[in-house]
């Protein structure tokens, strides 16, 4: 089989026939050096998954539940291409499983026990697997058989396709539990009708069901959605209030050597030639000899799944939790109101050591998880491997786009009521050596630059955003002659000045000596012309405050700030000479962990925060001798956010807009993956 062949897996005679037609029609339109199709027939989707894992086939299209199976070891497959529905302008690759209730009913998600439930059908995704999977650990024991546990949880249900003889309560609201449209409460519309008629208190459907059944907004306003955080939202806010976000139909391939670029090239060309309304003789999204053969008949086209996206991220935390609960059937010993330990994400070994010390001192209230980059940490928090970390504003933006929420903000100024008063922010500045007297904001081209890291606020987003507005392109590595911006591509001129050894060169963690505020300032001291840092960096590392050999003899007076008007000012005049105000660093977590992270961190700062006077003999949460490990070293306390509890509200409109503009220049693979899930 030539190298550019994609071996498509078919699961029936009809699929194999369509696959052969697909193969032949592709041959007729694609040059001989282009991608081609070969067909492999297997008895089932699970056999196809195994065949791809064993390198006997390359691709197959799967529903969400099977994407989960495909991801599990030893298969280790990943999503590579998604089918989309709707229009090319507004492509829908996901649907949302929701819990719909009547507006006046007054109960929340955690009060569903004893209510009457309407389901689309037993074993179906939005109507059964997701809600029951998420409620699984609240079901009465024994939880097997599952139908019995569900019957004992709700006071009555309509779950079409259930066995009405063995589990009569599941058919109480729709006698007989008929498994077709003959049952008026079957399917999405049926489950909604069950709620609408007053038979049930809650309907588990998908987000579009309400809109398809109620054209009139005034009618829709009689209903609400139950959110997982035990609040309610209007039905059109399903993106912020759902049980799970579910991919509709996805092509999977091997994680390693999986031909993902070739598969995309093939399918992209296929949709050009044989997509919706393209060709009479062969149609990719049509099944004359059956239904949904190879691809869904309702699909409109394909979108490439970003390479950073593994199956866990693609399926989302809620969906994976629901399906894992159903499959594995494991729950904590007894559900308690006690918070589980918070799994803190630590970057590289320096932060891990501090985190371990915190863990020991917290007596297990804190556990530690390691990752090599901030983005890897954010991904671990998203998928539940970790729970929380403190982030610079630039990463609060990425985390927010990935569905995480800020919970507490670092405060840097001593005040009587520190924990109750989140600050307005700190200043992003450009520092130069006083001796380089001709250097101004207007003649930085060709100079050597020092940055905290790519994607961070003071070190990147603010200065590069301002620069972008001036030069109108993203080739910052051409603007500066060389520099150190940890997280840049290793062959970039913006890694040339970095000092990390071997693989650690230019890494966005403390293994790179020029990483972070202190690192960027050190870069200026030793090699650079300008450093982009925070207003406190120079005083914190001069006058003997940093005992490291490179810093111990530095004098604040030997450095100046560049002002945007082309002038320069002494370091202490940052309030009148800065690039922008930056939002303080903040702790982020998943929505489901928000309350516990808040509670445990407030306890921890009372034990190990700024009130600890002797850090040589005691653990201090906000100290690491200028290394800013886990938290900035100048943190005085972690403050409540009050109503600034989303990333947009926390960062502020101006900063969100600035980072949004810089998105054109973003190299963040995680941001790309997260905006695929939520454009």
């Amino acid at each position: 089989v030539p190298d550019k062949t994609v071996r498509w897996c078919a699961v029936s005679e009809h699929e194999a026939t369509k696959c052969q037609s697909f193969r032949d029609h592709m041959k007729s339109v694609i040059p001989s050096d282009g991608p081609s199709v070969a067909c492999v027939k297997k008895a089932s989707y699970l056999d196809c998954i195994r065949a791809i894992a064993a390198n006997e086939a390359d691709a197959v299209t799967l529903d969400a539940g099977l994407v989960y199976d495909a991801y599990l070891a030893p298969n280790n497959l990943k999503p590579v291409v998604a089918e989309f529905y709707g229009s090319k302008e507004d492509p829908q690759t996901f649907y949302y499983a929701v819990a719909v209730v009547k507006k006046d009913s007054g109960f929340q998600m955690n009060q569903l026990r004893g209510k009457k439930s309407c389901h689309t059908g037993l074993g179906r995704s939005a109507g059964w697997n997701i809600p029951i999977g998420l409620l699984y650990c609240d079901l009465p024991e024994p939880r097997k058989p599952l139908e019995k546990a569900v019957a004992n949880f709700f006071s009555g249900s309509c779950a079409p396709c259930a066995d009405g003889t063995d589990f009569p309560q599941l058919c109480q609201l729709c006698p007989g539990c008929g498994c077709s449209t003959l049952n008026q409460y079957f399917g999405y519309s049926g489950a909604f009708k069950c709620l609408k008629d007053g038979a049930g208190d809650v309907a588990f459907v998908k987000h579009s069901t309400i809109f398809e059944n109620l054209a009139n907004k005034a009618d829709r306003d009689q209903y609400e959605l139950l959110c997982l955080d035990n609040t309610r939202k209007p039905v059109d806010e399903y993106k912020d209030c759902h049980l799970a976000q579910v991919p509709s139909h996805t092509v999977v391939a091997r994680s390693m050597g999986g031909k993902e670029d070739l598969i995309w090239e093939l399918l992209n060309q296929a949709q050009e030639h044989f997509g919706k309304d393209k060709s009479k003789e062969f149609q990719l999204f049509s099944s004359p000899h059956g239904k949904d053969l190879l691809f869904k008949d309702s699909a409109h086209g394909f979108l490439k799944v970003p390479p950073r996206m593994d199956a866990k991220m693609y399926l989302g935390y809620e969906y994976v939790t629901a399906i894992r609960n159903l499959r594995e059937g494991t729950c904590p010993e007894a559900p308690t109101d006690e918070c589980k330990p918070v799994k803190w994400c630590a970057l590289s070994h320096h932060e891990r050591l501090k985190c371990d010390e915190w863990s020991v001192n917290s007596v297990g209230k804190i556990e530690c998880v390691s990752a090599e980059t901030t983005e890897d940490c954010i991904a671990k928090i998203m998928n539940g491997e970790a729970d929380a970390m403190s982030l610079d504003g630039g990463f609060v933006y990425i985390a927010g786009k990935c569905g995480l929420v800020p919970v507490l903000a670092e405060n840097y100024n001593k005040s009587d009521n520190c924990e109750d008063t989140p600050e307005a922010g700190y200043f992003a500045i450009a520092v130069v050596k006083k001796s380089a007297s001709d250097l101004t904001w207007d003649n930085l081209k060709g100079k050597k630059s020092c940055h905290t890291a790519v994607g961070r606020t003071a070190g990147w987003n603010i200065p590069m955003g301002l620069l972008y507005n001036k030069i109108n392109h993203c080739r910052f590595d051409e603007f500066f002659s060389e520099g150190c911006a940890p997280g840049s591509k290793k062959d970039s001129s913006l890694c040339k000045l970095c000092m990390g050894s071997g693989l650690n060169l230019c890494e966005p963690n403390n293994k790179e000596g020029y990483y972070g505020y202190t690192g960027a300032f050190r870069c200026l001291v030793e090699k650079g012309d300008v450093a982009f840092v925070k207003h406190q960096t120079v005083p914190q590392n001069t006058g003997g405050k940093n005992p490291d050999p490179w810093a111990k003899n530095l004098n604040e007076k030997d450095y100046e700030l560049l002002c945007l008007d082309g002038t320069r000012k002494p370091v202490e005049e940052y309030a009148n000479c800065h690039l922008a105000r930056a939002p303080n660093h903040a702790v982020v977590t998943r929505k489901d962990k928000e309350a516990c992270v808040h509670k445990i961190l407030r306890q921890q700062q009372h034990l190990f925060g700024s009130n600890v006077t002797d850090c040589s003999g005691n653990f201090c949460l906000f100290r690491s001798e200028t290394k800013d490990l886990l938290f900035r070293d100048d943190t005085v306390c972690l403050a409540k956010l009050h109503d600034r509890n989303t990333y947009e509200k926390y960062l502020g409109e101006e900063y969100v807009k600035a980072v949004g503009n810089l998105r054109k220049c973003s190299t963040s693979s995680l941001l790309e993956a997260c905006t695929f899930r939520r454009p």
Epitope: L353, K354, E357, V360, G617, F619
Partner: nanobody
Framework: QVKLEESGGGLVQPGGSLTLSCAAS????????MAWYRQAPGKQRELVAG???????NYAGSVKGRFTISRDNAKNTVYLQMNSLKPEDTAVYYC???????????WGQGTQVTVSS
């Protein structure tokens, strides 16, 4: 600077016991939390157990109930009593005092523990 020296490792059969010791010398007034780590071949170094100056202890889930960490402040020594040893406990065991405030990796030689029949 605090200097740490680990000892007490060896070869032991599954189910057996060992006690590791770590003696500290130097500017020990600054020692607060002490901990035992281990590193198996090809694996990351991981925290096994820790103890604060006041004697508060914490353990990795995999050793809870089998290992006990203790310290003798008068002798500036921390111990790790390891019972019901399993083959997966095989590793080089290191102790650390965290007084270096997480600067570079400054680990001692460690002591090898091998659990095998």
């Amino acid at each position: 600077q605090v200097k740490l020296e680990e000892s007490g490792g060896g070869l032991v059969q599954p189910g057996g016991s060992l006690t590791l010791s770590c003696a500290a010398s130097g500017s020990i007034f600054s020692i607060n939390t002490m901990a035992w780590y281990r590193q198996a071949p090809g694996k990351q170094r991981e925290l096994v157990a820790g103890i604060t100056r006041s004697g508060t202890t914490n353990y990795a889930g995999s050793v809870k109930g089998r290992f006990t960490i203790s310290r003798d402040n008068a002798k500036n020594t921390v111990y790790l009593q390891m019972n019901s040893l399993k083959p997966e406990d095989t590793a080089v065991y290191y102790c650390t005092d965290y007084s270096r405030k997480y600067y570079e990796d400054q680990w001692g030689q460690g002591t090898q523990v091998t659990v095998s029949s």
